[in-house]
């Protein structure tokens, strides 16, 4: 059903990293425009991206209101220049997205090793606590603020001169690892939410090696 030459959106896909959340869909419009609605299970639909020719809509502002809720979005198609027109049943064509629960599904962004400090045979490695777009009391929360102990970091480290990797884990943003004195090490970090069934791990942070500018060394 639907107005002639108006087609329903398809391939609705959530793209979300650290709660920055965009809905994408197809097709590129020809003589039509789109409006997006989003709702939790309450059915209180909120319209966004009115009469757009884009095939994406930033829904971050809506999902950060409660990242533990499950959201559904729907994309309505209207004839360009005649947005009051509806389908043959008196309803505009629309398609639903998959369900999306940000807390369970947003991708974990690539972490950054903020600093490392060697004291004797110990190295303290700190992973940057990235800011998200989730707010509380007018302040942006960090990834750790949002996920708490659900979020761990894994550190992979190795002697610069070899390839055999060791691992360490922390449920804070800091590692304290044992190293050999006078030996240079390289490392990268990965964010992990072990309780998840999808999107459990981030991509790896950039590799950092001792002797580079982020490091500090004390005997």
């Amino acid at each position: 059903s639907g107005t002639t030459n108006t087609v329903a959106a398809y391939n609705l896909t959530w793209k979300s990293t650290n709660f920055k959340t965009i809905l994408e869909w197809e097709p590129k419009p020809v003589n039509q425009v789109y409006t997006v609605q989003i709702s939790t299970k309450s059915g209180d639909w909120k319209s966004k991206c009115f009469y757009t020719t884009d095939t994406e809509c930033d829904l971050t502002d809506e999902i950060v209101k409660d990242v533990k809720q499950t959201y559904l979005a729907r994309v309505f198609s209207y004839p360009a220049g005649n947005v009051e027109s509806t389908g043959s049943a008196g309803e505009p064509l629309y398609e639903n997205s998959p369900e999306f629960t940000p807390y369970l599904e947003t991708n974990l962004g690539q972490p950054t090793i903020q600093s490392f400090e060697q004291v004797g045979t110990k190295v303290n490695v700190t992973v940057e606590d990235e800011r998200t777009l989730v707010r509380r009391n007018n302040t942006f929360l960090s990834l750790r603020d949002v996920f708490g102990k659900d979020l761990i970091y894994t550190l992979y480290y190795w002697k610069s001169s070899s390839s055999g990797k060791k691992t360490a884990k922390t449920n804070t943003n800091e590692f304290l690892i044992d190293v050999e004195k006078g030996v240079s090490y390289c490392f990268f970090a990965q964010a992990v939410i072990p309780s998840r069934t999808v999107n459990r791990k981030s991509t790896d942070s950039p590799v950092e090696c001792m002797g580079q500018e982020k490091g500090e060394f004390r005997e």
């Epitope: 059903s1 639907g2 329903a8 709702s39 939790t40 299970k41 309450s42 059915g43 209180d44 639909w45 809720q69 559904l72 043959s88 049943a89 008196g90 309803e91 398609e95 639903n96």
Partner: antibody
Framework: EVQLLESGGGLVQPGGSLRLSCAAS????????MSWVRQAPGKGLEWVSS????????YYTDSVKGRFTISRDNSKNTLYLQMNSLRAEDTAVYYC???????????WGQGTLVTVSS | DIQMTQSPPSLSASAGDRVTITCRAS??????LAWYQQKPEKAPKSLIY???SLQSGVPSRFSGSGSGTDFTLTISSLQPEDFATYYC?????????FGQGTKLEIK
């Protein structure tokens, strides 16, 4: 466990009124749209009305528009259906149901019988 | 209003049988369709939503398929507790409408 318990049904004369209630428990009531569905004796299911979690959006089947009013009190976890100007054809078991996104009906009450007869 | 037509209206089968019930919408509803099971004197129970998504707690012998106007509910191996009446429902647009039901009886 989700529980929905309807009450308020009974025998009423044509032209009369009844208010049905549905007490909800086991979930965050305000987070869900809710619906009323009815079933006349020996017949199939008929969707009657739906309301969004905030109560801001309400929807009705044509045959009850202007006669029935759906409402909710989120502080009491209760859904209502005010039925006025009742007709014989409104005789049915009325079910309250939870309705994610105001779409399908994932949990149902046990129903309450409304009989409209003189 | 969108009309929902189920077939067959009634069906006799035996435990262990594979059973298919169909539902046809009078116009395209994408995959906005649900299936319910109702036993005598009981409230309906949700089985399937979004045409093919299994409701939590429903046995995997139940499955749904279809999109647009034609949909099916399949029970892969009938169990004694599956004898009941089955309804489809569209939630594409208001007023939401149900099929007239398919009564599944023991042969």
């Amino acid at each position: 466990e989700v529980q929905l318990l309807e009450s308020g049904g009974g025998l009423v004369q044509p032209g009369g009124s009844l208010r049905l209630s549905c007490a909800a428990s086991g979930f965050t009531f305000s987070n869900y749209a809710m619906s009323w569905v009815r079933q006349a004796p020996g017949k199939g299911l008929e969707w009657v009305s739906s309301i969004s979690g905030s109560g801001d959006y309400t929807y009705y089947t044509d045959s009850v528009k202007g006669r029935f009013t759906i409402s909710r009190d989120n502080s009491k976890n209760t859904l209502y259906l005010q039925m006025n100007s009742l007709r014989a054809e409104d005789t049915a078991v009325y079910y309250c149901a939870r309705s994610p996104w105001g779409y399908y009906l994932d949990s149902w009450g046990q129903g309450t019988l409304v009989t409209v007869s003189s | 209003d969108i009309q929902m037509t189920q077939s067959p209206p009634s069906l006799s089968a035996s435990a262990g049988d594979r059973v298919t019930i169909t539902c046809r919408a009078s116009q395209g509803i994408s995959s906005r369709l649900a299936w319910y099971q109702q036993k005598p004197e009981k409230a309906p129970k949700s089985l399937i939503y979004a045409a093919s998504s299994l409701q939590s707690g429903v046995p995997s012998r139940f499955s749904g398929s279809g999109s647009g106007t034609d949909f099916t509910l399949t029970i892969s191996s009938l169990q004694p507790e599956d004898f009941a009446t089955y309804y489809c429902q569209q939630y594409n647009s208001y007023p939401y409408t149900f099929g007239q039901g398919t009564k599944l009886e023991i042969k």
